[in-house]
Structures are given as C-alpha cells and as structure tokens.
C-alpha cells in the first residue's frame, strides 16, 4: 500500500495505490483511491508511467481525456467512471503486455487540493493447476498441468502425509513454450503416489503462487486449487 | 448492512434551531461523504449540503448557507445537521443520505421538522 | 446551478404499461445522472444510477439512458409496486440538483 499527500498543508489529499501484477493477454488492474469529492467537475484524475512521454489516462470534466494519451496504451485504458464520485481512480488496463510493468504514478486532482502516488505493476503470465492422476503410466502417477506461466516458475511436491519429504527425485517437471513464444505450459509428474495422500503442486514465480492438491483414496479423487498474487502491497 | 437512522420528530417554534442526528452504521464513516436532503410537504427534493468527516469538510447550497450547520462526531458515527432561525417555509422531512458507493445510495428514514407558533 | 426539467410531472397508467421519464439538464451532465423512487411516507430508493446501471435489486424492467443534457428512465411494462414518484439527479456540477419529480399513477 503507498500512500501519496499533496505538496502543500490543507491543499493535500490522500491518495492511495496497491501494487499489483497483470496476466499477460488478459485486462488488468491499476488499483488507486483518493479522498472523495463532491464536485465530480472539478476532479482530474493523471495516470502516469515512468519513462513514457504522453499520459497513460486522463480523466477530467466527468469523461476521458485522451488528446494526450501515449501511443503503447491507445484504446487500451478506461477509469470506472461512476466510481469516480466516491474516490475510484483505479484503472482498467486492457491486453496486458509484458512491456506494461514498471512504475505508474496516480495524479488526482480536486476541489479540495491535489495528490499522488506511485505503484508498482508487474507483468507476467500464472494460471491455476490441475493435478490428475495419470492411468497411461506403469506406476501410481501424478500428473500437474498449468497452461500459461512465465517468468518460468519453480514447481514443488509435497504430500499430507510425509510433510517435509523432497519429491524432486521422483518427479519430473518440463516447460513447453507456447504459440505466442512468451509464455509456457507447465508440466510435472509425480511418481510412486501412494493411496490414501493428498498431494500438493506448488507453482511459484515472482508474481504468483499457485497450488493444485489431490486427495485420492480408494473410492474417490478430491481436487482444489487456489492461486495468490505475491505483490499485492498498497502505497 | 448499511444503516442511516435517524433522530425523531421535532417541533419549533419560528427563530428557534433544531438539530438533527443521523447514526450510520455497515460502512467507513470517515472516509465518505454524507449529505443532507429536504422534502417540504407535497413538494420535491433539495439539497442542504453535505460534509466529509474524516476532515470536517462541509460544502451547503447557497440557499442554506450561513443558516445550516453540518458536523460529524466520528467516535459514534453520527452526523448532524443545524438549522438556525427556523420560520414556517422549514416545515419538511429532512433525511440524510449517504454517497458511499454512488450518489445519494443510501437514505436515513427521514426525521419531520414542524415549524408552528 | 444546473436545473433539472423533468416531465411530465405526473402520469397515469395502467399495469403493463410502458412508461417512459424524461428529465432534461439545462447543460451536459455527462451522463452524471441517478434516478429514485419515492413512494408516500418513504424515504426515496436508489434506482439507477450513472444514466443506465442498475442499482443492486431493481427489478431489470427499469432502465435508463441519454447523454448530454437529455435523459430517460423507462419502466418497460409497470407493474403495481411501481406507482410512485420518480426523480431524477444530477451530481456533474455543484450543487447536486433533482428534477421537480413524475407521479406515476394508476388509470
């Protein structure tokens, strides 16, 4: 969380960002929120991106401001314009490239006296894992799929049962680029599962975590998985 | 649940004042702003004004101004709004009425000022 | 102030009706308009807000829109918990300002 004031005394508001990652190829979110004014007229809202000439997005007089707009985000920025009223100057971020992390500054602007702050906006590519069990082996296996990570992650086993065990000998984890050559798919398997366990697959980059469990006993297969962002700190 | 209750109904007579309270409950008082409406009876809505508690910042219609009063006491989430020189054309319903997620969201049950000699 | 004309200022109509409000700014408000529904002795309802959203349970046979200074709330077929009065906001330029209110009533 960054919290931004104003430059000067009574002429400052609070401003406040939250560092946050986009997916590749998917909308994204810049999240900034500022002391609410009732003169929706009179509130600019500045979206600004370290090293990039023209704005990211601008908002003032209740519409959007684009004469100023860089090229890289044409067509690709929107702020929630009913939500600017109570202090939302989040922005919406279209097809998020990789070339759209580094550091962005939210400007606001309003009746009541001005205000920044800066966030931090990582880019990458995670996704959920599924872990099946994989018949076609010889051997009770486990099979960890994700379609789209990168940067490329670290993958991790671990079981309920023996709890601070090391998989790695046998498991076997490979990194398949996909079509658009940026991101990969990940693949790992596990060998001699025994009956009666829940395993976990742990996928792991800078930006997200990931994690696949499958419980599997004799008359059923029970499977949950959950993904957590990494950098979600507020400014 | 968000919640704006109100104080009861009152009766003034002309020049007196009359203060009423609003208890917000379900959402971070401080840090919306909170606004005043009033009905005359048969008659449509106007705003008062409204104030912002985290900073006991208040803005009034130019009609009100100088007549009106806006305050918060954050310790109970309470707002307040002061009417001064009361005369017969105040007689309405005055509510309370919070900007939360939009404009005017929420409303308190309305409080009846009655103005008589 | 911006004033808000809102017409008509009453109406009668039957159940299943199509009703259409129309509130009309003396500038551009920018689509910064909300609509409520008052009925007697009740504090008014938020129904409809930034021109055409939906407020969380209002029933989807309310719908608004319009730019500029030109705005509409439409109830596409009226049903008996509908009779009310309707006003409308603005919240673009200070003061926020209603419309003079539409009584809907039954035919």
């Known amino acids: 969380l960054i919290i931004g004031f104003g430059i000067s005394g009574r002429h400052s508001i609070t401003v406040t960002t939250v560092a946050s990652a986009g997916n590749i190829g998917e909308d994204g979110i810049l999240s900034c929120t500022f002391e609410p004014d009732i003169k929706l007229s009179d509130i600019v809202i500045q979206w600004l991106k370290e090293g990039v000439l023209g704005l990211v997005h601008e908002f003032k007089e209740g519409k959007d401001e684009l004469s100023e707009q860089d090229e890289m985000f044409r067509g690709r920025t929107a702020v929630f314009a009913d939500q600017v009223i109570v202090g939302n100057a989040s922005l919406r971020l279209k097809n998020v490239q990789l070339t759209d992390a580094g550091t962005y500054k939210c400007y606001i602007i309003t009746s009541k006296g001005k205000g920044n702050a800066n966030l931090e906006y990582k880019t990458g590519a995670f996704s959920m894992p599924e872990v099946n069990v994989d018949y076609n082996a010889s051997s009770e296996t486990l099979r960890c799929e994700a379609p789209r990570w990168f940067p490329q992650p670290t993958v991790v086993w671990a079981s309920q049962v023996d709890q601070g065990a090391n998989f790695s000998e046998v498991s076997n984890t490979s990194f398949e680029l996909n079509s658009e050559n940026v991101t990969m798919k990940v693949v790992s398997v596990l060998y001699n599962v025994t009956i009666n366990n829940t395993y976990s697959c742990m996928i792991e980059n800078d930006i997200a975590k990931a994690t696949g469990d499958i419980k599997v006993t004799e008359s059923e297969i029970k499977r949950r998985s959950h993904l957590q962002l990494l950098n979600s700190k507020a400014s | 649940e968000v919640q704006l209750v109100q104080s009861g109904a009152e009766v003034k007579k002309p020049g007196a004042s009359v203060k009423v309270s609003c208890k917000v409950s379900?959402?971070?008082?401080?840090?919306?702003?909170m606004h005043w409406v009033r009905q005359a009876p048969g008659q449509g809505l106007e705003w008062i004004g409204a104030i912002y508690p985290g900073k006991s910042d208040t803005e009034y219609a130019p009609k009100f101004q100088g007549r009106v009063t806006l305050t918060a006491d954050t310790s109970t989430s309470t707002a307040y709004m002061e009417l001064s020189s009361l005369r017969s054309e105040d007689t309405a319903v005055y509510y309370c009425?919070?900007?939360?997620?939009?404009?005017?969201?929420?409303w308190g049950q309305g409080t009846t000022v009655t103005v008589s000699s | 102030d911006i004033q808000m004309t809102q017409s008509p200022s009453s109406l009668s109509a039957s159940v299943g009706d199509r009703v259409t409000i129309t509130c009309q700014a003396t500038q551009d408000i920018v689509k910064s308009l909300n609509w409520y529904q008052q009925k007697p002795g009740k504090p008014p309802k938020f129904l409809i807000y930034?021109?055409?959203q939906l407020a969380e349970g209002v029933p989807s046979r309310f719908s608004g829109s319009g730019s500029g200074t030109d705005y509409t709330l439409t109830i596409s077929s009226l049903q008996p918990e509908d009779f009310a009065t309707y006003y409308c906001l603005q919240f673009y330029e200070f003061p926020p300002t209603f419309g003079g209110g539409t009584k809907v009533e039954i035919k």
């Open positions: 930034y021109t055409a």
């Open positions: 379900g959402y971070p008082f401080t840090s919306y702003w």
């Open positions: 009425t919070s900007t939360w997620t939009h404009y005017f969201d929420y």
